[in-house]
Amino acid sequence: GSMGPVIRQGPVNQTVAVDGTFVLSCVATGSPVPTILWRKDGVLVSTQDSRIKQLENGVLQIRYAKLGDTGRYTCIASTPSGEATWSAYIEVQ
């Protein structure tokens, strides 16, 4: 059957250095395995940007951090039964 997702470990607030690489993690359980999407300030994060890598294990990696990467990032874990969200604020300086 289908079971609503639960985020076991979500992203954490952090301050990161400009030009560095930082990650946002989102470990979720559910049935079937939840789909993970990321939004920044409400807008879907595009992995078309070569700086942004969707790694395994629900990890979003952002290379060459820019001041414009500052914002609230939300992990959305979804299954047919529903969705769960977890947000964190990232400041690039």
Epitope: F22, V23, S25, L55, E56, N57, V59, Q61, R63
Partner: antibody, heavy 120, light 107 residues
């Protein structure tokens, strides 16, 4: 193929510019890195640069002293090193960042290295 | 910064044996770990990426495993050609720190 040049002996406070000539692949589509191996055999990433040269990263140990750049028309990667210290003594390698799925950072081609000695 | 602790610093084994090198991270690196092999007088070579994925041209005698903070590299049926120093590298967040290396020798 990656071939580094420009190493040598330099006094503390001095400068040196390393070059890395690339061939055999489409240089302009790859991010590149500089890694050094210190006399005690430790490895340290000292610079990364993206494919178009618009973004760079340096660890705190070299930030403000080292600058990486590239000339995609000539297929050459550079590392300008200034205010050199004795702890910068190392073998310097240029390396190509692999295009992998999943997209983990890994270096799949390395040059033969060029030696830099900072000594008075 | 994420610290990488590699052990042992050196080991000696006989041809045909299986050896394991371990690498510990100071925090969870979610499988973002790379292994390199550096033979004497040569440049490093990519061996394993993403903790478990074997680089294209490498022997299947090499295998990577682990998750969270603990990772290992196993070399099965040791060959004389495996004499080298092996390094792990954190590739989750910068600085992308390397372990201090494990020097493998043949008895």
């Amino acid at each position: 193929q990656l071939v580094e040049s420009g190493g040598g002996v330099v006094q503390p406070g001095g400068s040196l510019k390393l070059s890395c000539a690339a061939s055999g692949f489409t240089f302009s589509t790859y991010d590149m890195s500089w890694v050094r191996q210190t006399p005690d055999k430790r490895l340290e990433l000292v610079a990364t640069i993206n494919s178009n040269g618009g973004s760079t990263y340096y660890p705190d140990s070299v930030k403000g002293r080292f600058t990486s750049s590239r000339d995609n028309a000539k297929n050459i990667l550079y590392l300008q090193m200034s205010s050199l210290k004795s702890e910068d003594t190392a073998m310097y390698y240029c390396a190509r960042e692999a295009l992998l799925r999943p997209a983990y950072y890994a270096l799949d081609y390395w040059g033969q290295g060029t030696s830099v000695t900072v000594s008075s | 910064d994420i610290q990488m602790t590699q052990s042992p610093a050196s080991l000696s084994a006989s041809v045909g044996e299986t050896v394991t090198i371990t690498c510990g991270a100071s925090e969870n690196i979610y499988g973002a770990l790379t292994w390199y092999q550096r033979k004497q007088g040569k440049s490093p070579q990519l061996l394993i990426y993403g903790a478990i994925n074997l680089a294209d041209d490498k022997s299947s005698r090499f295998s990577g495993s682990g998750s969270g903070r603990q990772y290992s590299l196993k070399i099965s049926s040791l060959h004389p050609d495996d004499v080298a120093t092996y390094y792990c590298q954190n590739v989750l967040s910068t600085p992308f720190t390397f372990g201090s290396g494990t020097k493998l020798e043949i008895k």
